[in-house]
């Protein structure tokens, strides 16, 4: 029986009965928050062989091993993951071993086994036989291995039953528990699974099989399952579903959801039955099961029941996330906020059409309206009194409407009104009239030339750069000395710069009146010598990174015709020089024969330029004599099992942490202080743990249903 879609067992251990007839869990399996220690010995689910998503165990008191619960769990597919993990075992206070002795394959994702104070038999499992890549596994804060004394079957009797593999240069027996070996298939099978008798399964099998070379005898399928057979691809008129089986159109049409309406049911796209059209596609009509590509961003119509949506905070803007067409009116009233411009762009940046009017008033936090970066049409189907469809009143810091060189905005019906916007130049408003097609609609009082732009440098001259020099982490720029009509009106210059991977930034990007600004700012005083051109050295930059830079002259206010005369440059794009890349990551080496080494690595996190090749160096090392001093055939006295507290030790502390023998005749000395890199790594590690724990808690703690 296929169970799903996802099973959550919590609070009451008797809920485990829900798994009774499951052979495949289509979705996830959560077993968590069972605080009363119970006897799980009567619970056994031998039918369960596959979990298509992930397995999560969290705070289940009294459970000592998973082997009795799931003796035949063979594959966890990881089609969807829990924070990148397909197997999570977290804060399982009584778990002594994992014991999933039939687990042969975790198809996607890593494992996270953390803060399990009594958990042993972790170093005896070779996860590389189960997962493709072990580098992302996270196994910390469990019982220290030296307190476990993990023994594989037969070791004490000197008749070892398990096979050996090498992990971290340690060649050892591999087992799940004191009486269960880790199964390994003969090398002749290659990547194929095998039966209990070591016969190779059919190539389409995954994990195991009941008969050799038979695609109907697989425990799980490598690709897809259809009508009792493992197939490499779904046959005609069937569709991939949940990453593991083939279903027909009727099946797909009959999947229900409590979250969405029946007209938003599953769709068939690109040979797959899926919950919704993928990014960039939309349903081919409201009653269709099929997807077609969107032209531009996919449309999402949002409607306000009260006709007018007031945006007075990030929270209210959040309701418009993803909307491309807004049916109603927008009233923007942002008086304060943190990082408001980029937050608004995040939530309102896709809006293309507003069917009613747009009113911006008392929005003192706004410097620009560029957060509405895709607005192209205001229909004006509903207008404010006086027939206004675009109304801008009393915005003390508004300096820019949009970047009209890169913006087409049409106002289909209605007039514009602008008043009491002291930093908004009238020329900017006139430009909007031309672009939007509203020129001639406004009457004289609709655009007030006295109280718009009264405190702005509206008649701007252009500053020209004269030279630029770059190194790997510095840029030197100079520009023409600006000479206003009265030299005393020039106070200083401000240089603005930021990383700009693409040449599409504007002066007002990410800028608001509450201090948030995506640009770095540096003040540059006037050179005392009137003939010297002003300039600046920007340092601490990243190698091989494109920066955008512009300069503004800072001038005294109220100069000509009661308006400020100012100057600024165009935006200059400039790239720093290349530099030495950081070290390649995750270097792994393994020997696959007596004369070969296979070395793998990931690219450096900071390439600092275009990588063209890698240099691999190697040298022969003398054999370490220490390896011969110990008789590895004798098993030393097994350490006493001491209960660990489940906290995470960053390092194992010796008896006397203050003194370490530092070699030679130096005698005892203090432990070496941690390097900055080590401290940073520890800090990041702790941060990563916190992020995961928050994610876990946020995912699993839900309010009780009423």
């Amino acid at each position: 029986e296929i169970c799903g879609p996802g099973i959550d067992i919590r609070n009451d251990y008797q809920q485990l009965k829900r798994l009774e007839n499951c052979t495949v869990i289509e979705g996830y399996l959560h077993i968590l928050l069972i605080s009363k220690a119970e006897d799980y010995r009567s619970y056994r689910f031998p039918k369960l062989t596959v979990i298509t998503e992930y397995l999560l165990l969290f705070r289940v008191a009294g459970l000592e091993s998973l082997g009795d619960l799931f003796p035949n769990l063979t594959v966890i597919r990881g089609w969807k993951l829990f924070y990148n993990y397909a197997l999570v075992i977290f804060e399982m206070t009584n778990l002594k071993d994992i014991g999933l002795y039939n687990l042969r394959n975790i198809t996607r994702g890593a494992i996270r086994i953390e803060k399990n104070a009594d958990l042993c038999y972790l170093s005896t499992v070779d996860w590389s036989l189960i997962l493709d890549a072990v580098s992302n596994n996270y196994i910390v804060g469990n019982k220290p291995p030296k307190e476990c004394g993990d023994l594989c079957p037969g070791t004490m009797e000197e008749k070892p039953m398990c096979e050996k593999t090498t992990i971290n240069n340690e060649y050892n027996y591999r087992c799940w528990t004191t009486n269960r070996c880790q199964k390994m298939c003969p090398s002749t099978c290659g990547k194929r699974a095998c039966t209990e008798n070591n016969e190779c399964c059919h190539p389409e099998c995954l994990g195991s099989c009941s008969a050799p070379d038979n695609d109907t005898a697989c425990v799980a399928c490598r690709h897809y399952y259809y009508a009792g057979v493992c197939v490499p691809a779904c046959p005609p008129n069937t569709y991939r579903f949940e990453g593991w089986r083939c279903v027909d159109r009727d099946f797909c049409a009959n999947i229900l959801s409590a979250e969405s309406s029946d007209s938003e049911g599953f769709v068939i796209h690109d040979g797959e039955c899926m919950q919704e059209c993928p990014s960039g596609f939309i349903r081919n009509g409201s009653q269709s099961m099929y997807c077609i590509p969107c032209e531009g961003p996919c449309p999402k119509v949002c409607e306000e029941e009260k006709k007018t949506k007031t945006i007075d905070s990030v929270t209210s803007a959040q309701m418009l996330q993803g909307c491309t067409i807004f049916k109603g009116n927008l009233l923007i009233n942002i008086r304060r906020g943190n990082n408001i411009a980029s937050e608004l762009e995040n939530f309102m940046g896709l809006i293309e059409v507003v069917t009613g009017y747009v009113k911006i008033r008392h929005s003192h936090a706004l410097v620009s309206l560029s957060f509405l970066k895709n607005l192209r049409l205001i229909l004006g189907e509903e207008q404010l009194e006086g027939n206004y469809s675009f109304y801008v009143l009393d915005n003390q810091n508004l300096q820019q409407l949009w970047d009209w060189d890169h913006r087409n905005l049409t106002i289909k019906a209605g007039k514009m009104y602008f008043a009491f916007n002291p930093k908004l130049c009238v020329s900017e408003i006139y430009r909007m009239e031309e672009v939007t097609g509203t020129k001639g609609r406004q009457s004289k009082g609709d655009i007030n030339t006295r109280n718009n732009g009264e405190r702005a440098s509206c008649e701007s001259d252009v500053l020209h750069f004269t030279s630029t020099t770059t190194s790997k982490n510095r840029i030197i720029i100079t520009w023409h000395r600006y000479r206003p009509p009265d030299y005393r009106d020039l106070i200083s210059f401000t240089v603005y710069y930021k990383e700009a991977p693409f040449k599409n930034v504007t002066e007002y990007d990410g800028q608001d009146a509450c201090g948030s600004n995506s640009w770095n700012m540096v003040d540059v005083d006037l050179p005392p010598n009137k003939d010297v051109e002003p300039g600046i050295l920007l340092h601490g930059l990243k190698p091989w990174t494109q920066y955008a830079v512009y300069v503004k002259a800072v001038t005294l206010t109220m100069v000509e015709n009661d308006h400020i005369r100012g100057a600024k440059s165009e935006i200059l794009y400039i790239r720093t020089n290349a530099s030495v890349p950081s070290i390649p990551l995750d270097v792994l080496s393994a020997s696959n024969s007596s004369s070969q080494l296979i070395v793998k690595w990931n690219p450096p996190s900071l390439p600092n330029g275009n990588l063209s090749y890698y240099i691999v160096r190697w040298q022969r090392q003398p054999q370490d004599g220490y390896l011969y001093r110990h008789n590895y055939c004798s098993k030393d006295k097994i350490p006493i099992r001491k209960y660990a507290d489940g906290t995470i030790d960053i390092e194992e502390v010796t008896e006397n942490p203050k003194t370490e023998v530092c070699g030679g005749e130096k005698g005892p000395c203090c432990a070496c202080p941690k390097t900055e890199a080590e401290k940073q790594a520890e800090k990041e590690e702790a941060e990563y743990r916190k992020v995961f724990e928050n994610f876990l808690h946020n995912s699993i703690f839900v309010p009780r249903p009423e």
Partner: antibody, heavy 118, light 107 residues
Framework: EVQLVQSGGGLVKPGGSLRLSCAAS????????MHWVRQAPGKGLEWISV???????YYADSVKGRFTISRDNAKNSLYLQMNSLRAEDTAVYYC????????????WGQGTTVTVSS | EIVLTQSPGTLSVSPGERATLSCRAS??????LHWYQQKPGQAPRLLIK???QSLSGIPDRFSGSGSGTDFTLTISRLEPEDFAVYYC?????????FGQGTKVEIK
């Protein structure tokens, strides 16, 4: 011929249990969502539960926690396990496949009577 | 849950006349509304699906209209076999719900 044949109704005491069955034929049972609908004597239709093709189950508030819908695709059968029965559960129970956006197919069982009385 | 309210509760019409039945939803359900006919001792029979889509085998005197919250079933000329109880049913959101029914009787 597409049909649904019901069984399992009868007289039961309050607090008792009963299991209704519905056997499907003439269509690919596993590819369709299946519903239970009931009708109390002289009253209107009341939707009570559905199980979709994945096995996901949904219930009306009036039966949540007491009734369990399940299916066995190998046997082409739909079930309704009714526990903690009350007098107000007395009704004719229908199993049905209700059409959806993409199909007009709408199939109902003949109905089976459940009487809850002491 | 979405509540469906049918009106009138009973409709008395003469054969050959037109009958108009109404169904109102407590919130917008798009076009996910269906009309059923039920005769005594029988299981319901689907007449109209998704507000206005007719089904094969159903006489074309039955038609449906509406979307959002207001829906109508129209029987253009009542035949003797049309006297029955009519139910609307929404499938837009789970749990599904039925209206309380409209009884169409001979005047």
């Amino acid at each position: 011929e597409v049909q649904l044949v019901q069984s399992g109704g009868g007289l039961v005491k309050p607090g008792g249990s009963l299991r209704l069955s519905c056997a499907a034929s003439g269509f690919t049972f596993s590819s369709f969502a299946m519903h239970w609908v009931r009708q109390a004597p002289g009253k209107g239709l009341e939707w009570i539960s559905v199980i979709d093709t994945r096995g996901a189950t949904y219930y009306a508030d009036s039966v949540k926690g007491r009734f369990t819908i399940s299916r066995d695709n190998a046997k082409n059968s739909l079930y309704l396990q009714m526990n903690s029965l009350r007098a107000e559960d007395t009704a004719v129970y229908y199993c049905a496949h209700l059409g959806n956006f993409y199909y007009g197919m709408d199939v109902w069982g003949q109905g089976t009577t459940v009487t809850v009385s002491s | 849950e979405i509540v469906l309210t049918q009106s009138p509760g009973t409709l008395s019409v003469s054969p050959g006349e037109r009958a108009t039945l109404s169904c109102r939803a407590s919130q917008s359900i798009g076009s996910s509304l269906h009309w059923y006919q039920q005769k005594p001792g029988q299981a319901p029979r689907l007449l109209i699906k998704y507000a206005s889509q007719s089904l094969s085998g159903i006489p074309d005197r039955f038609s449906g209209s509406g979307s959002g919250t207001d829906f109508t079933l129209t029987i253009s000329r009542l035949e003797p076999e049309d006297f029955a109880v009519y139910y609307c049913h929404q499938s837009s959101r789970l749990p599904h719900t039925f209206g309380q029914g409209t009884k169409v009787e001979i005047k």
